[in-house]
Interface confidence: medium
């Protein structure tokens, strides 16, 4: 045995591997260094999850993951004397954590959340297959800017879906949106299996509708100017401009990726305002415009949730039918 062992020699396994849950979905494994490790070994720890995913070699004796605890999750940990991935680590020690007890068929399904206008989050879910129709639900949530887990108070019904909404305002701190909201739904009586979800704050963002400020004609072009929803900068949004002409009964939709107010016809330097020129519009007919917006992948992971349509605004004259 002794202190002169070569660093390539397999190290003893780590000791006291344990697992705990913090918040709602932060799973933390901690362990102690191996007993009797070689004295000339600078200890590193090799770890991966049960499916051989997310391999990591690091000197820390802890590893954490943010994961919805709807399924069992296991971490395997071994020790080694270098950061070399090809070095054979010690015997791997495994520790698993299982989701809370309960009939899987009782857990709510379709649990999803949308961050509305970066100001409040609205989550909704469907009762589980084996659930009494009069089950009362509670939603709990946690994110980095909260000291403790909060209970959502505003439970509502929308058709067959249950839901709850809670305030969640974008903080000026630039790292705020790099985090997630952890969600858990269970019933008050403790009869159903809890369901978990993790909502990254860069996804599932639904802006408020924009507000049309001005429509004007210049030659045969229609200039549209609008105010973007609060909390969003224009470069983070894509737009859809819909123009309906009452006389020709045409319905044109323009997908706009950039909406700068650079033409002299547009009112300048108005904060958070975007503009678009619709070509070839007949000024002597009635044109009705509405706009919607969605987040783009320059700033967000998700670009699927359109806002509702803005209020319509019309310009031009309705011709008398003869």
């Amino acid at each position: 045995g002794g202190g002169g062992a070569a660093p390539t020699e397999t190290q003893p396994p780590v000791t006291n591997l344990s697992v705990s849950v913090e918040n709602l979905c932060t799973v933390i494994w901690t362990w102690n260094p191996p007993e009797g490790a070689s004295s000339n070994c600078s200890l590193w720890y090799f770890s991966h999850f049960g499916d051989k995913q997310d391999k990591k070699i690091a000197p820390e004796t802890r590893r954490s993951i943010e994961v919805p605890l709807n399924e069992r999750i296991c971490l395997q940990v071994g020790s080694q004397c270098s950061t070399n991935e090809s070095e054979k680590p010690s015997i791997l020690v495994e520790k698993c954590i299982s989701p809370p007890e309960g009939d899987p068929e009782s857990a709510v399904t379709e649990l999803q959340c949308i961050w509305h206008n970066l100001s409040y989050m609205k989550c909704s879910w469907l009762p589980g297959r084996n659930t009494s129709p009069d089950t009362n639900y509670t939603l709990y949530y946690w994110h980095r800017s909260l000291e403790k887990i909060h209970q959502c108070e505003n439970i509502f019904r929308e058709g067959q879906y249950f839901g709850c909404s809670f305030d969640l305002t974008k903080v000026k701190d630039s790292s705020f949106e790099q985090h997630s909201v952890q969600i858990m739904v269970k019933d008050n009586a403790g009869k159903i299996k809890p369901s978990f979800n993790i909502v990254p704050l860069t996804s599932r963002v639904k802006p408020d509708p924009p507000h049309i400020k001005n429509l004007s004609f210049h030659n045969d072009d229609l200039y549209v100017q609008w105010e973007n929803p609060q909390n969003f900068i224009s470069r983070c949004l894509f737009y859809e401009v819909e123009v309906n002409n009452s006389q020709t009964e045409t319905h044109n939709v323009f997908y706009v990726q950039e909406a700068k107010c650079e033409n002299p016809e547009f009112e300048r330097n108005v904060e958070n305002t975007s503009c678009f020129m619709v070509p070839g519009v007949l000024p002597d007919t009635l044109n009705t415009v509405r706009i919607r917006v969605k987040t783009n992948k320059l700033c967000y992971e998700d670009d699927k949730l359109w806002s509702n349509w803005s209020q319509e605004m019309s310009i031009g004259k309705k011709r008398n039918s003869t």
Epitope: T109, E110, L126, P127, R129, P133, R157, G159, Q160
Partner: antibody
């Protein structure tokens, strides 16, 4: 006023396929589960399948599992039932039925469309 | 699967009669039973849900009761338009199942 209008029924040979549609109006379609329930000639009612409002969750009766597929297009307010490997005992009037707010019983029914499986 | 057994399978009654139809579940289903009315060549119509709650627009002569395994649909004073077939349905657990029906005929 809630209205459900089925279509797509007809005569089909055993082993054949058919796709039923149900056009819905008069309610917010995408927040209610929709069902297919069938009734063989002179017989009682048999629940066939259900799909949740967002179209994510589906359940089937054992008698049709693996052969029938329920789906919906919320942009068109339309429910579908794709029926494959049809058998003589699938002959029935097929009703689409709206789930109530508890997504379990049926508060509105369509008028039904007849599917006949025969050679 | 939960079996729903209705009785009687048919009955004859006169206008003004009080009519009672029972439905027995093969296992306890709390109060998760609905009742439907079906007339010949027509779609079923919802009458009662959650054992005793009247669907909107349904006349108050219809009432439901029961919990656990035994459920009852009562028509307090039979009207000409009530001659039809009545079905119970359980929605406590999948697959949802119906009773075999009770035909109410004119005596």
């Amino acid at each position: 006023e809630v209205q459900l209008l089925e279509s797509g029924g007809g005569l089909v040979q055993p082993g054949g396929s058919l796709r039923l549609s149900c056009a819905a109006s008069g309610f917010t379609f995408n927040i209610y589960a929709m069902n297919w329930v069938r009734q063989a000639p002179g017989k009682g009612l048999e629940w066939v399948s259900v799909i949740s409002g967002r179209g994510i969750t589906t359940y089937y009766a054992d008698s049709v599992k693996g052969r029938f597929t329920i789906s919906r297009d919320n942009s068109k307010n339309t429910l579908y039932l794709q029926m494959n490997s049809l058998r003589a005992d699938d002959t029935a009037v097929y009703y689409c039925a709206k789930g109530s707010s508890s997504w379990t019983d049926f508060d509105y029914w369509g008028q039904g469309t007849l599917v006949t499986v025969s050679s | 699967d939960i079996q729903m057994t209705q009785s009687p399978s048919s009955l004859s009654a006169s206008v003004g009669d009080r009519v009672t139809i029972t439905c027995r579940a093969s296992q306890g289903i709390s109060r998760w039973v609905a009742w439907y009315q079906q007339k010949p060549e027509k779609a079923p119509k919802s009458l009662i849900y959650a054992a005793s709650s009247l669907q909107s627009g349904v006349p108050s002569r219809f009432s439901g009761s029961g919990s656990g395994t035994d459920f009852t649909l009562t028509i307090s004073s039979l009207q000409p338009e009530d001659f039809a077939t009545y079905y119970c349905q359980q929605y406590n657990s999948y697959p949802w199942t119906f009773g075999q029906g009770t035909k109410v005929e004119i005596k």
